[in-house]
Interface confidence: low
C-alpha cells in the first residue's frame, strides 16, 4: 500500500490511509488511570461542569484516498479528524495555530468520533482490472468523552452530544452510522 501524501484544508500533510482510525493509546489498556500519582483516580479538572455546551473539541476536515490492496479511489474523500484533547469551548481556538490550547492535567478527556456516514467510492485498480466500488465509513462529527474512574473500553462519559444526534422518531440520512468509535487511521480492512 502506498503512502502518498497530500494536503487537507488545514494545510497539513496527510498520508494515504485505509478505512479505520485507531483508538488513542490510553484506551488500549485499563491501567491508564491507575497510576500512583493519581491514586487510581482521574486528576481534578477545574473546568468540569454540568453545562455540556461548555465542552468542545476540534473537528478538522481532511482529504484522503481510500485504498483496497493495490486499488485506490478515483477521487479523495473528505472527512473529519477529531483532534486532541477536549476543553471548555470558550478556550478552544477557531483556527489552527491561533489562541491558547487548553489541556487538562491528565489524559482523561478525549475528542473522538461521534457519528459516521457511509460513502460509496469507486476504486481504480492497476493492470487493467475493472474498477471496484466500496463503501467506507467516514467520521461525520466529533464529541468529547471523559474517561471515568477505573475505566475500561466502554466506560466513557459523553459530553454535549445530544444535539448532534438525530431526534427520536426521525430517520437520519440513509446510511448515516449514528455511532462513535475511533480515531487516527489504520490498516485496510481487506
Amino acid at each position: 500500500q502506498g503512502w502518498q501524501a497530500f494536503k487537507n484544508d488545514a494545510t497539513e500533510i496527510i498520508p494515504e490511509l485505509g478505512e479505520y482510525p485507531e483508538p488513542p493509546p490510553e484506551l488500549e489498556n485499563n491501567k491508564t488511570m491507575n497510576r500512583a500519582e493519581n491514586g487510581g483516580r482521574p486528576p481534578h479538572h477545574p473546568f468540569e461542569t454540568k453545562d455540556v455546551s461548555e465542552y468542545s473539541c476540534r473537528e478538522l476536515h481532511f482529504t484522503r484516498y481510500v485504498t483496497d490492496g493495490p486499488c485506490r479511489s478515483a477521487k479523495p474523500v473528505t472527512e473529519l479528524v477529531c483532534s486532541g484533547q477536549c476543553g471548555p469551548a470558550r478556550l478552544l481556538p477557531n483556527a489552527i495555530g491561533r489562541g491558547k490550547w487548553w489541556r487538562p492535567s491528565g489524559p482523561d478527556f478525549r475528542c473522538i468520533p461521534d457519528r459516521y456516514r457511509a460513502q460509496r467510492v469507486q476504486l481504480l485498480c492497476p493492470g487493467g482490472e475493472a474498477p471496484r466500488a466500496r463503501k467506507v465509513r467516514l467520521v461525520a462529527s466529533c464529541k468529547c468523552k471523559r474517561l471515568t474512574r477505573f475505566h475500561n473500553q466502554s466506560e466513557l462519559k459523553d459530553f454535549g452530544t445530544e444535539a448532534a444526534r438525530p431526534q427520536k422518531g426521525r430517520k437520519p440520512r440513509p446510511r448515516a452510522r449514528s455511532a462513535k468509535a475511533n480515531q487516527a487511521e489504520l490498516e485496510n480492512a481487506y
Epitope: 483508538p23 473522538i112 460509496r120 489504520l186
Partner: antibody, heavy 116, light 111 residues
C-alpha cells in the same frame, strides 16, 4: 489469516447467565467493529450486537438490557455476557468482523441452549 | 426500520442459472448499494459471497454475481453446481438502529 473462534456456549436454565468469548487473530483487532449474530435452530440469521473500536455498544431490541457486548483489545477477545436468558435465546452464536458495513469473516459458532 | 424479504426456496439443475431475490420495505435498499449476500452450508458458519450489491470477495467464484433494481437486490448463480446447495441470506445496514438486517434466507436445492 483471519480467524475468529467462539467459546463459552452450553446448556443453561431460563433466567441463568452465560458468557461467550471470541478469540481473534490474523488482523488488527482493535481497529475493527465486531458483532455477534445468532441463529436459532432451523431459523435464519439475527444480528444481536455490535461494538465499535472505542467500546461503544449497540443491541438488537430483543436482547437490550440483558446482553452486554465488550472487548479486550489487549487479549484480542470479544465477549458477550448474557443474563436473564430465555428459551428463545437458544441459538448458535457467531462473532463476525464488521468491515465496510458487512461481515467479511465469521467464527464457527458456539451453541447456547436455554432449557429447564 | 428496514425489512428484507426473500423466497423461502429456489431450485435448479446443474449447469443452470438461478436468481434469488431480496426485496426491501424501505427505499434505502434501492437508493444505496449496500446489500450483502451470505452462503451457509448446514452446520457451517455463513460466508460472505457478495457485498455492496455486486462485489465479490477474493476467493469467491465468478459464477456468483449480484445486481439490484429499485428496492430489489438479486443474487444470480450461473453454471449451478452441487456444492452451491445451501442457504443464502441477503443483508443490509440499518442506519438508525446501527444494526445489520438479514433477510429470512432462501434454501437453494440443486436437483
Amino acid at each position: 489469516q483471519v480467524q475468529l473462534v467462539e467459546s463459552g456456549g452450553g446448556l443453561v436454565q431460563p433466567g441463568g447467565s452465560l458468557r461467550l468469548s471470541c478469540a481473534a487473530s490474523g488482523f488488527t483487532f482493535r481497529s475493527h467493529w465486531l458483532s455477534w449474530v445468532r441463529q436459532a435452530p432451523g431459523k435464519g440469521l439475527e444480528w444481536v450486537s455490535v461494538i465499535t473500536p472505542y467500546g461503544d455498544t449497540y443491541y438488537a431490541d430483543s436482547v437490550k438490557g440483558r446482553f452486554t457486548i465488550s472487548r479486550d483489545n489487549s487479549k484480542n477477545t470479544l465477549y458477550l455476557q448474557m443474563n436473564s436468558l430465555r428459551a428463545e435465546d437458544t441459538a448458535v452464536y457467531y462473532c463476525a468482523r464488521d468491515t465496510y458495513l458487512h461481515f467479511d469473516y465469521w467464527g464457527q459458532g458456539t451453541l447456547v441452549t436455554v432449557s429447564s | 426500520d428496514i425489512a428484507l424479504t426473500q423466497p423461502a426456496s429456489v431450485s435448479g439443475s446443474p449447469g443452470q442459472s438461478i436468481t434469488i431475490s431480496c426485496t426491501g420495505t424501505s427505499s434505502d435498499v434501492g437508493d444505496i448499494n449496500d446489500v450483502s449476500w451470505y452462503q451457509q452450508h448446514p452446520g457451517k458458519a455463513p460466508k460472505l459471497m457478495i457485498y455492496d450489491v455486486n462485489n465479490r470477495p477474493s476467493g469467491v467464484s465468478n459464477r456468483f454475481s449480484g445486481s439490484k433494481s429499485g428496492n430489489t437486490a438479486s443474487l444470480t448463480i450461473s453454471g449451478l453446481q452441487a456444492e452451491d446447495e445451501a442457504d443464502y441470506y441477503c443483508s443490509t445496514y440499518d442506519g438508525p438502529g446501527l444494526s445489520e438486517v438479514f433477510g429470512g434466507g432462501t434454501k437453494l436445492t440443486v436437483l
